[in-house]
């Protein structure tokens, strides 16, 4: 029995930050779980982890240097990624694992979300065009 995950097909990070919501066909209330976000087609980089426990505060961390935070809904986890670089444009996959109560459950691999990180372009304002060329 697998949990189904829904993600937006694509998100654009205009200000080098993005909220990626992972929606599950499973209620996480009073469960011990590990929700994670993985980068790349092969999910090789674990970007962020949200650990939830019925008796403890939510714990969020990244072992790979990403600036991330997480929020929990009954059937969702939202990852908030900040300080993204243009070269981190990639496909990102949500993963959910329920550790307790037994049996262990995880998800069918989702379709993923392409996060397109737009660089901050410092364009001259039309009101202040800057120095004209001689």
């Amino acid at each position: 029995n697998k949990i189904l995950v829904k993600q937006s097909p694509m998100l654009v990070a205009y200000d080098n930050a993005v909220n990626l919501s992972c929606k599950y066909s499973y209620n996480l209330f009073s469960r011990e779980f590990r929700a994670s976000l993985h980068k790349g087609l092969d999910s090789a980089v674990e970007v962020c982890v949200v650990y939830g426990n019925y008796s403890q505060q939510l714990q969020v961390y990244s072992k790979t240097g990403f600036n991330c935070d997480g929020k929990l809904g009954n059937e969702s986890v939202t990852f908030y990624l900040q300080n993204l670089y243009v070269n981190q444009t990639d496909i990102y996959f949500c993963k959910i694992e329920v550790m307790y109560p037994p049996p262990y459950l995880d998800n069918e691999k989702s379709n993923g979300t392409i996060i397109h990180v737009k660089g901050k372009h410092l364009c001259p304002s039309p009101l202040f065009p800057g120095p004209s060329k001689p």
Partner: antibody, heavy 120, light 107 residues
Framework: EVQLVESGGGLVQPGGSLRLSCAAS????????IHWVRQAPGKGLEWVAS????????RYADSVKGRFTISADTSKNTAYLQMNSLRAEDTAVYYC?????????????WGQGTTVTVSS | DIQMTQSPSSLSASVGDRVTITCRAS??????LNWYQQKPGKAPKLLIY???NLYSGVPSRFSGSRSGTDFTLTISSLQPEDFATYYC?????????FGQGTKLEIK
């Protein structure tokens, strides 16, 4: 009380086999990785293998890959290390330890260790 | 694999001394560094996790810090029970690896 208790160590000839056991108690077995870490006489600590009993995912150090097999029985809250094709350099005290599956970075509880001696 | 280089390999000190042990990672492991104490014939015990967090029940004379890929374990005032071997361990990437150990002896 949270406890890990190893057993199964002993003297074995090169090329022989041995199975170590690690009985866990006092915590939710499926919330933790179980690891084997060894220490050769007078040497430092070396991580050997790990298993997450929830989904039976395993990892091995290159030095034991293909020779050692880690497994777990959730009905008995026990992990095992099956050691085949043993070599003199496998001689060590073998410790069973745990790390949290959701917060996996340190080994917070250790067993007392079991001694494996590979010698002819 | 990530290499952990610990220094010094041995150290002589007296009760009441302030002692520092260093561990260097071969690549950036962020805060994912732990310290253990081991006494002869016994299993290691966790002292510090995530570079600077004191594990439950560990005396406050033990502390840890990080500067880039360099990590430090400090014992502010050595007690007789602190003479032991100390190991660092990286918990960022499998295979988890340990430093070679620092043996702290009585001067």
């Amino acid at each position: 009380e949270v406890q890990l208790v190893e057993s199964g160590g002993g003297l074995v000839q090169p090329g022989g086999s041995l199975r170590l056991s690690c009985a866990a108690s006092g915590f939710t077995f499926t919330s933790y990785y179980i690891h084997w870490v060894r220490q050769a006489p007078g040497k430092g600590l070396e991580w050997v293998a790990s298993i997450y009993p929830g989904n039976v995912a395993t990892r091995y150090a290159d030095s034991v890959k293909g020779r050692f097999t880690i497994s777990a029985d959730t009905s008995k809250n026990t992990a095992y290390l099956q050691m085949n094709s043993l070599r003199a350099e496998d001689t060590a005290v073998y410790y069973c330890t745990r790390s949290h599956y959701g917060l996996d970075w340190n080994f917070d509880v250790w067993g007392q260790g079991t001694t494996v001696t590979v010698s002819s | 694999d990530i290499q952990m280089t610990q220094s010094p390999s041995s150290l002589s000190a007296s009760v009441g001394d302030r002692v520092t042990i260093t561990c260097r990672a071969s690549q950036n492991i962020y805060v994912w560094l732990n310290w253990y104490q081991q006494k002869p014939g016994k299993a290691p015990k966790l002292l510090i996790y995530k570079a600077s967090n004191l594990y439950s029940g560990v005396p406050s004379r033990f502390s840890g810090s990080r500067s880039g890929t360099d990590f430090t374990l400090t014992i502010s005032s050595l007690q007789p029970e602190d003479f032991a071997t100390y190991y660092c361990q990286q918990g960022q990437t499998y295979p988890y690896t340990f430093g070679q150990g620092t043996k702290l002896e009585i001067k």
